[in-house]
Interface confidence: medium
């Protein structure tokens, strides 16, 4: 990481917990005000590797609802609208940060957690294994 | 949301701050231990809508390094390896949570922030606007 001079106005941290436990303001600042989600909302249907969106819900997690992509086909859709099995539809996965209530059912105590989610699908050339 | 009975062992919260400011344990729990394919798939090179990865750095954010996908072409790669402009390469975007140091340069005080990142690209049929 990068060394940053410490701001003298920082909240105190107890040595026994620091830096494991920190204070987090849950008033989310959204930096995406100029983005237009309407434009991308139908990619899952128009893609040559289309996907369905499945709702993953967990009340002990923040955010409690995460949408997961599942590719519709093993192959990709060709120009004729048929599935071409010479190509593969594969999920694009990303690790994301979520907050997990810890201890369970506590409204104001969380642990940072990383989970792997499928965001969408892309069409790839398969890896061909040649037999010697 | 779902109502969850409060755990009596939860840390106390001061009413004036609650529920805006919470305690978060930064010892990350990784839930992805079993999702470990033996091969790295290099989808960004093998996709019909290939992308480059760009490093987005911000020392005031956790995580401080985020990789962003940028589609290489406006069109998609066809079976001959050429760019087909009858199709479009588009970024698959996802909103993710990050922690922003607040006040700046504080090691143990953060604000939750949502940012939009491009995770990869997919090939879509373009929307054709017919002129009346």
């Amino acid at each position: 990481g990068i060394t940053i001079p410490r701001n003298p106005g920082c909240p105190n941290s107890e040595d026994k917990n620091f830096p494991r436990t920190v204070m987090v303001n849950l008033n989310i600042h959204n930096r995406n005000t100029n983005t237009n989600p309407k434009r991308s909302s139908d990619y899952y249907n128009r893609s040559t590797s289309p996907w369905n969106l499945h709702r993953n819900e967990d009340p002990e997690r923040y955010p409690s609802v995460i949408w997961e992509a599942k590719c519709r086909h093993l192959g990709c859709i060709n120009a004729d609208g048929n599935v071409d099995y010479h190509m593969n539809s594969v999920p694009i996965q990303q690790e994301i940060l979520v907050l997990r209530r810890e201890p369970p059912h506590c409204p104001n105590s969380f642990r940072l957690e990383k989970i792997l989610v499928s965001v969408g699908c892309t069409c790839v050339t398969p890896i061909v294994h040649h037999v010697a | 949301g779902i109502t969850i009975p409060r755990n009596p062992g939860c840390p106390n919260s001061e009413d004036k701050n609650f529920p805006r400011t919470v305690m978060v344990n930064l010892n990350i729990h990784n839930r992805n231990t079993n999702t470990n394919p033996k091969r790295s798939s290099d989808y960004y090179n093998r996709s019909t809508s290939p992308w480059n990865l760009h490093r987005n750095e911000d020392p005031e954010r956790y995580p401080s390094v985020i990789w962003e996908a940028k589609c290489r072409h406006l069109g998609c790669i066809n079976a001959d390896g050429n760019v087909d402009y009858h199709m479009n390469s588009v970024p698959i975007q996802q909103e993710i949570l990050v922690l922003r140091r607040e006040p700046p340069h504080c090691p143990n005080s953060f604000r939750l922030e949502k940012i939009l990142v491009s995770v990869g690209c997919t090939c879509v049929t373009p929307i054709v606007h017919h002129v009346a």
């Epitope: 990303q94 690790e95 | 091969r39 790295s40 960004y44 990865l53 490093r55 390094v65 990789w67």
Partner: antibody, heavy 120, light 110 residues
Framework: QVQLVQSGAEVKKPGASVKVSCKAS????????MNWVRQAPGQGLEWMGD????????IFNQNFRGRVTMTRDTSISTAYMELSRLRSDDTAVYYC?????????????WGQGTLVTVSS | DIVMTQSPDSLAVSLGERATINCKAS??????????MHWYQQKPGQPPKLLIY???NLEAGVPDRFSGSGSGTDFTLTISSLQAEDVAVYYC????????FGGGTKLEIK
Amino acid sequence: QVQLVQSGAEVKKPGASVKVSCKASGFTFTDYYMNWVRQAPGQGLEWMGDINPKNGGTIFNQNFRGRVTMTRDTSISTAYMELSRLRSDDTAVYYCARSILTGPFYFDYWGQGTLVTVSS
Amino acid sequence: DIVMTQSPDSLAVSLGERATINCKASQSVSFAGTGLMHWYQQKPGQPPKLLIYRASNLEAGVPDRFSGSGSGTDFTLTISSLQAEDVAVYYCQQTMEYPTFGGGTKLEIK
């Protein structure tokens, strides 16, 4: 062919500064990050930071606590790394290495290394 | 920072035999299906040389007895048939976050 040629060995006293240069040839200088990696005698590799020659942006490893400065001169395709307030444990071979701006950032060519000895 | 743990620290293998070096990251170093893990070989008095990039891709000019595998947190460098010129120190490197290297594995001939 791609080459990264570094300046010669240096002997410095504790508290002094050293500036090492890395001249690039055989590729477009502004298409690659220039990284600096050091290796103390008999030890492993430690990344110090990098510079984006396109805009001069730098990122540093926190272990160097503001002692390192990275600059570049695009007109002569040369990157520089200056380390100040030298200590005896800064004695090491310092390498420059390039990595493409479009990621994912492996170091495909390295300079020959510059030995910096810090001794009173 | 992501901590890279290499094992073993040193390894003695007979000529023509297989050598395997492991690297474990303290957190996942895969992004969108790409392992941001790379392997280098360093011989005495020389700079490191890139062998494998993005977990499993062989750098141009590197003999195909070298191979890499793995994803997430666990990666492996394999030399299928050890040659005398492979005696060196091998390092793994992650570039998921600011780059960090493993501690190195010294490979010798038994």
